[in-house]
């Protein structure tokens, strides 16, 4: 492991569309990839009238947008689908929204997907 980097070996997995996509609904996903590539966890969710609805969680491929992020935080201002990624085992268990453009209350979500 490179000093100062959190190695990602597994991530929380969730798929709200598991029946349609024919996948597991929940679990722990082992992350694989080329040896020279970094691996990340991610979360995607929607905010429906203030209610958080998780879309997917799992492993994410090498992506510079995720480098050295120990926390999963979406910074885009009011996207239709929120996305965050991070480095470190199971770092996508919790995810947050901190828009860069304006100062608002963060929606910090230690969400456990329901079966």
């Amino acid at each position: 492991a490179i000093l100062g980097r959190s190695e990602t070996q597994e991530c929380l997995f969730f798929n709200a569309n598991w029946e349609r996509d024919r996948t597991n609904q929940t679990g722990v996903e082992p992350c694989y990839g080329d040896k020279d590539k970094r691996r990340h966890c991610f979360a995607t969710w929607k905010n429906i009238s203030g209610s958080i609805e998780i879309v997917k969680q799992g492993c994410w491929l090498d992506d510079i947008n995720c480098y050295d992020r120990t926390d999963c935080i979406e910074k885009k201002d009011s996207p239709e689908v929120y996305f965050c990624c991070c480095e470190g085992n199971m770092c996508n268990e919790k995810f947050s929204y901190f828009p860069e453009m304006e100062v608002t209350q963060p929606t910090s979500n230690p969400v456990t997907p329901k079966p």
Partner: antibody, heavy 120, light 107 residues
Framework: EVQLLESGGGLVQPGGSLRLSCAAS????????MNWVRQAPGKGLEWVSN????????GYADSVKGRFTISRDNSKNTLYLQMNSLRAEDTAVYYC?????????????WGQGTLVTVSS | DIQMTQSPSSLSASVGDRVTITCRAS??????LNWYQQKPGKAPKLLIY???SLASGVPSRFSGSGSGTDFTLTISSLQPEDFATYYC?????????FGGGTKVEIK
């Protein structure tokens, strides 16, 4: 080096059957989801089917549902596509492709393809 | 199903030109957008994944951008080996769907 090698294509009459195989090497086959994607002559890419790392979950395009069956033998590092009740519109080059994650973020490696021709 | 619409369907360009291809999804797909390059008689090759990330061995003249529903593939300075057909693909949900392709031809 990741390698995917398809075989089993050929000429078949409408209503007939074929089984395609995809031999994988150069990676831990039983850790990855796998896909079949096809391309009709002169046309674009169409996803056909996928299967998760252990064969527990499968998915199909509506155009092949009920006629095609995807499977895998992890002990042989091989992916299969059983194609029944073939139609002229199934004529295409069939590619197997590796899914990068459980949720198929991207199809990161592809085979060279095998041609299936359905004609009387 | 999520529809992926690419434009233009074909374009003619010269070596050294800057080329831009666009892809629009029928609904938001967040960052689940990939680009592939295909040369005649060959298998597609992953070019860019997750909107902006270059696949292994892909030259830096290729770049991707966008989010939500609108995405762009840019070739900063077209090289002779770049004449090919390019496809976008969403993996936000099943079925995986591809754009119709953009054929980049020599002017």
């Amino acid at each position: 080096e990741v390698q995917l090698l398809e075989s089993g294509g050929g000429l078949v009459q409408p209503g007939g059957s074929l089984r395609l195989s995809c031999a994988a090497s150069g990676f831990t086959f039983d850790s990855y989801s796998m896909n079949w994607v096809r391309q009709a002559p002169g046309k674009g890419l169409e996803w056909v089917s996928n299967i998760n790392y252990n064969g527990g979950y499968t998915g199909y395009a509506d155009s092949v549902k009920g006629r095609f069956t995807i499977s895998r033998d992890n002990s042989k590092n091989t992916l299969y596509l059983q194609m029944n009740s073939l139609r002229a519109e199934d004529t295409a080059v069939y590619y197997c492709a590796r899914g990068a994650n459980w949720h198929d973020t991207a199809l990161d490696y592809w085979g060279q393809g095998t041609l299936v021709t359905v004609s009387s | 199903d999520i529809q992926m619409t690419q434009s233009p369907s074909s374009l003619s360009a010269s070596v050294g030109d800057r080329v831009t291809i666009t892809c629009r999804a029928s609904q938001s797909i967040s960052r689940y957008l990939n680009w592939y390059q295909q040369k005649p008689g060959k298998a597609p090759k992953l070019l860019i994944y997750a909107v902006t990330s270059l696949a292994s061995g892909v030259p830096s003249r290729f770049s991707g951008s966008g989010s939500g529903t609108d995405f762009t593939l840019t070739i900063s300075s077209l090289q002779p080996e770049d004449f090919a057909t390019y496809y976008c693909q969403q993996s936000y949900e099943s079925p995986l769907t591809f754009g119709g392709g953009t054929k980049v031809e020599i002017k």
